[in-house]
């Protein structure tokens, strides 16, 4: 039978005894940033092309034995893991290792720059298929790291790191901190966090999406023939390389947004049991566990959506926090979460002719969270419609007055401390869908787009108050792109979006005792594209 | 790896272009910040990232390297340009002494300074 | 559950050897390093050293090189500690301990045996 | 090895906090991640912290490290009986390329 790891990831459609699914991702280079590699092992001999590059540091040790067999150790492995012919995910593609690593699996910075600078220049000198750059190791944060990423991304690299094995906030580490990079954390058989010893998997908003990383078969360097089980975040990257491999392979023309959105989407959702990881850290890591895409092609009619949560604003009065989408995503909705449930909403703004999400504490609140709903929306032209805070009784209204334009986010932001002792601000586009409405001393903030084929409706869901949590979620064909909520006189934390179901939390009555009436409601705005599914359709 | 007199004779030519007035002014208004890892462990002082502002020509980052190395000669400091970059970030990477941090941030087109630190398999 | 046995307590005259072993069971020995440590009767906690993972470096106390060896045999997930030249002042409790880097960022000790007396007397 | 300073005991009464500090170079505190220990009498030495502040899962949060320049501390809070023990602290230490360990400390519960 076919190890786990290879099951997992497959599709059932695919899952014989054997692993085979179709296209080994030929059309793709792998570039391996990691230690050595026995490159005659049988497992990869003649699909790894050893660089001459090499930038390590010396080992350290009194009495240090350098045996090539564990010089090669790591690097050997994960090669297998990602292209190996029997225990590899893409059979078909082909490497080129860097050696970033010394014998004891440690590098630099620097190290890695060239090694990324070394790619980059190959790229332009040698211009080839699509690339998928696999990084699997981790240091301290490092700006120019994270910098080095993103330049590479942006000349369309795929870039796949390990999220880290230090049982931590990815965000801490880099590359795993820097956004363009596919960050990836570690699941076991059981789908459970991976434990490492008193360590394990990293977790957290800068962690994509998690894949097979505990008890992995692969080659081992120990000979030409042998296999050995390896664990860590790096074999769980080296999955999303393989996986990424053969989905570019499939479709070499998607960018870096596509293959990220489609990663996540054809993941398996829900499975990873939260408990293992700080409570703080549960609603910022998804719940995600890779796999590939039932058929190669056909994915197109969808409309792809991520959530995108901020770094933590701080707890200071005037605190804000910002997320952001990547540069080929729409923004299509903003939504803010306070664990204290002290903020003052949040708006959709531009910054540097891109909209951003920015959320904002309120006194005496321990800070917030903004929460972007990122899209992948061709041909798109949206623009935010804001009205101010209404004199009128009767609350603030905006609504997407544009032929051709809908719907897709409802925002609300106020100056006052705490609107709850007031009335809390209420989105009510019901009935009007291209209409929100708000308390009257909020400034109502409406995403409005035009796309081809573009149609949205709303849906809402209401339970009776006291309630910690409501949801509602899009059916099937609708992609989720607008949460926000319609709170009774409860005290609402927040709203954000969890795969295509739209979340809202309220504060939690048993700490504060409140037993008022009316009903905490979510709203979830949910679209589609006819235009996309013409098209994919077309193309099939 | 480069021998010590190919070292010095390139510190020698750095501080005659110096001399002869070839070096531009820093810019104004521009505060270039440092970096370094927040792990003690896994930092590697001594080594440091130089990194340049966006649109700088490969020369100008050539031309930068080579006047931190005249101004530290001058105050008796070596230091080594263990490699230039270009194609991803414009910059270099310089083996120096911490003392001459400050005398770094001061050039012009520098945008950060990051210290080196170890990256390790996961 | 994660667990290092330790062999039996031993007493040795001055001058001879004695080898300690440590079992470990329910993790994967070979993705951690490994420490020797030891108390002697009333008195603090000393290092001895550490072993890598895979046996490719190694680590010494002052007191210990020249005289102890760490030693591992992966297949066996059993460590070793090699004692020659034993002197009274060797007379302590050793403990083995797993280090808690898989490979190289954390030295801290997380799981440690039970203890392993020896005596040096004459 | 020069072994990590630490004071010889310090005391507390049930429910107060007790700090042990641990004085190092920089060679070691200053530039190490530093770990605390607790041996409990006739037992083998637990990790209550490392990386200075981090616990492991099972050790509860009235312990608390931090560090500042060449000096770690260990506080515990909401102090118990059950914390009668003595604490080491531990650092890798760069010149020496070999572990530290502090003096030693034995926390006493008055009452």
């Known amino acids: 039978s076919i190890p786990w790891n290879l099951e997992r990831i497959t599709p059932p459609r695919y899952r014989a005894d054997e692993y085979q699914p179709p296209d080994g991702g030929s059309l793709v280079e792998v570039y391996l940033l990691d230690t050595s590699i026995q490159s005659d092992h049988r497992e990869i001999e003649g699909r790894v092309m050893v660089t001459d590059f090499e930038n390590v540091p010396e080992e350290d040790g009194t009495r240090f034995h350098r045996q090539a067999s564990k010089c090669d150790s790591h690097g050997t492995h994960l090669a297998g893991v990602v292209s190996g012919r029997d225990a590899g995910v893409a059979k078909g593609a082909s490497m080129r290792s860097l050696r970033v690593l010394n014998c004891q699996g440690k590098g630099t910075v620097s190290g890695t720059l060239i090694g990324l600078e070394f790619i980059r220049k190959s790229q332009l000198v040698q211009p080839v298929g699509p690339l998928v750059v696999l990084l699997p190791l981790a240091g301290g944060y490092s700006r120019v790291l994270n910098a080095a990423c993103q330049r590479l991304a942006r000349a369309g690299v795929v870039l796949v790191t390990a999220a880290g094995n230090f049982r931590d906030d990815a965000c801490l580490y880099s590359p795993a901190s820097a956004p363009e990079v596919i960050t990836v954390g570690a699941t076991n058989a059981q789908d459970q966090p991976v434990t490492l010893g008193t360590l394990g998997t990293n977790f957290g908003r800068c962690v994509d999406l998690f894949a097979p990383g505990e008890d992995i078969i692969g080659a081992s360097s120990y000979c030409s023939t042998c296999f050995v089980s390896q664990s860590g975040t790096s074999q769980a990257a080296a999955h999303v390389a393989g996986i990424a491999a053969m989905m570019l392979s499939a479709e070499p023309e998607l960018t870096l947004a596509e293959l990220r959105q489609r990663l996540i989407h054809f993941s398996a959702k829900d499975v990873i049991n939260e408990a293992w990881f700080p409570e703080d850290q549960r609603v910022l890591t998804p719940n995600l566990v890779a796999a590939l895409p039932p058929s190669t092609h056909g994915a197109g009619w969808q409309l792809f959506c991520r959530t995108v949560w901020s770094a933590h604003s701080g707890p200071t009065r005037m605190a804000t926090a910002v997320a952001r989408c990547a540069p080929d995503e729409e923004l299509l909705s903003c939504s803010s979460f306070s664990r204290s449930g002290k903020r003052r909403g949040e708006r959709m703004e531009a910054q540097g002719g891109k909209l951003v999400c920015r959320a904002h504490n309120a006194f005496g609140g321990e800070g917030v969270y903004a929460i972007a709903r990122c899209c992948l929306l061709p041909q798109a032209n949206c623009s935010v419609h804001t009205a101010p805070p209404a004199e009128a009784s009767m609350g603030t209204r905006v609504h997407c007055h544009q032929q051709g334009h809908v719907l897709t986010g409802c925002s609300s932001h106020w100056e006052v401390e705490d609107l709850g002792t007031h009335k809390p601000p209420v989105l009510r586009p019901r009935g009007q869908p291209n209409q929100c409405v708000g308390h009257r001393e909020a400034s109502i903030h409406a995403s409005c787009c035009h796309a081809p084929g573009l149609e949205c409706k709303v849906k809402e869901h209401g339970i009776p108050a006291p309630q910690e949590q409501v949801t509602v979620a899009c059916e099937e064909g609708w992609t989720l792109t607008g949460c926000s909520a319609l709170p009774g006189t409860s005290h609402v934390l927040g709203a954000y979006a969890v795969d295509n179901t739209c979340v809202v939390r309220s504060r939690d009555v048993s700490t504060t005792g409140s037993t008022s009436e009316g009903a905490v409601t979510a709203v979830a705005i949910c679209c589609r594209s006819r235009h996309l599914a013409q098209a994919s359709q077309e193309l099939q | 790896q480069e021998d010590e007199d190919g070292d010095y004779e390139e510190l020698v030519l750095a501080l005659r272009s110096e001399e002869d007035g070839l070096a531009e002014a820093p810019e104004h208004g521009t505060t270039a910040t440092f970096h370094r890892c927040a792990k003690d462990p896994w930092r590697l002082p001594g080594t440091y990232v130089v990194v340049l502002k966006e649109e700088t020509h490969l020369s100008q980052s050539e031309r930068t390297a080579r006047r931190l190395q005249a101004q530290a000669a001058r105050r008796g400091y070596l230091t080594k340009i263990l490699h230039v970059f270009h194609g991803l970030l414009p910059g270099f990477l310089v083996k120096m002494s911490g003392d001459l941090l400050e005398l770094a941030l001061k050039l012009p087109h520098v945008d950060y300074i990051e210290e080196d630190s170890s990256v390790f398999a996961q | 559950q994660v667990q290092l046995v330790q062999s039996g307590a031993e007493v040795k005259k001055p001058g001879s050897s004695v080898k300690v072993s440590c079992k470990a069971s329910?993790?994967?020995?070979?993705?951690?390093?490994m420490h020797w440590v030891r108390q002697a009767p009333g008195q603090g906690l000393e290092w001895m050293g550490l072993?890598?993972?895979?046996?490719?470096?190694?680590y010494y106390a002052d007191s210990a090189k020249g005289r102890f060896t760490i030693s591992r045999d992966n297949s066996k997930n059993t460590l070793y500690l090699q004692m020659n030249s034993l002197r009274s002042d060797d007379t302590a409790v050793y403990y083995c301990a797993r280090a808690m880097g898989a490979i190289y960022y954390y030295y801290a000790m997380d799981v440690w045996g039970q203890g392993t007396t020896v005596t040096v007397s004459s | 090895q020069s072994a990590l300073t630490q004071p010889p005991s310090v005391s507390g009464s049930p429910g107060q906090s007790v700090t042990i500090s641990c004085t190092g170079t920089?060679?070691?505190?200053?530039?190490?991640?530093v770990s605390w220990y607790q041996q409990l009498p006739g037992t083998a030495p637990k990790l209550m912290i490392y990386?200075?502040?981090k616990r492991p899962s099972g050790v509860p949060d009235r312990f608390s490290g931090s560090k500042s320049g060449n000096t770690a501390s260990l506080t515990i809070s909401g102090l118990q009986t059950g914390d009668e023990a003595d604490y080491y602290c531990?650092?890798?230490?760069?010149?020496?390329?070999?572990?530290?360990f502090g003096t030693g400390t034995r926390v006493t519960v008055l009452g």
């Open positions: 990386e200075y502040n």
């Open positions: 072993l890598w993972s895979d046996g490719s470096g190694e």
């Open positions: 329910a993790f994967t020995f070979d993705s951690f390093g």
């Open positions: 920089s060679s070691n505190i200053g530039n190490q991640f």
């Open positions: 531990g650092s890798w230490d760069s010149s020496l390329s070999g572990y530290v």
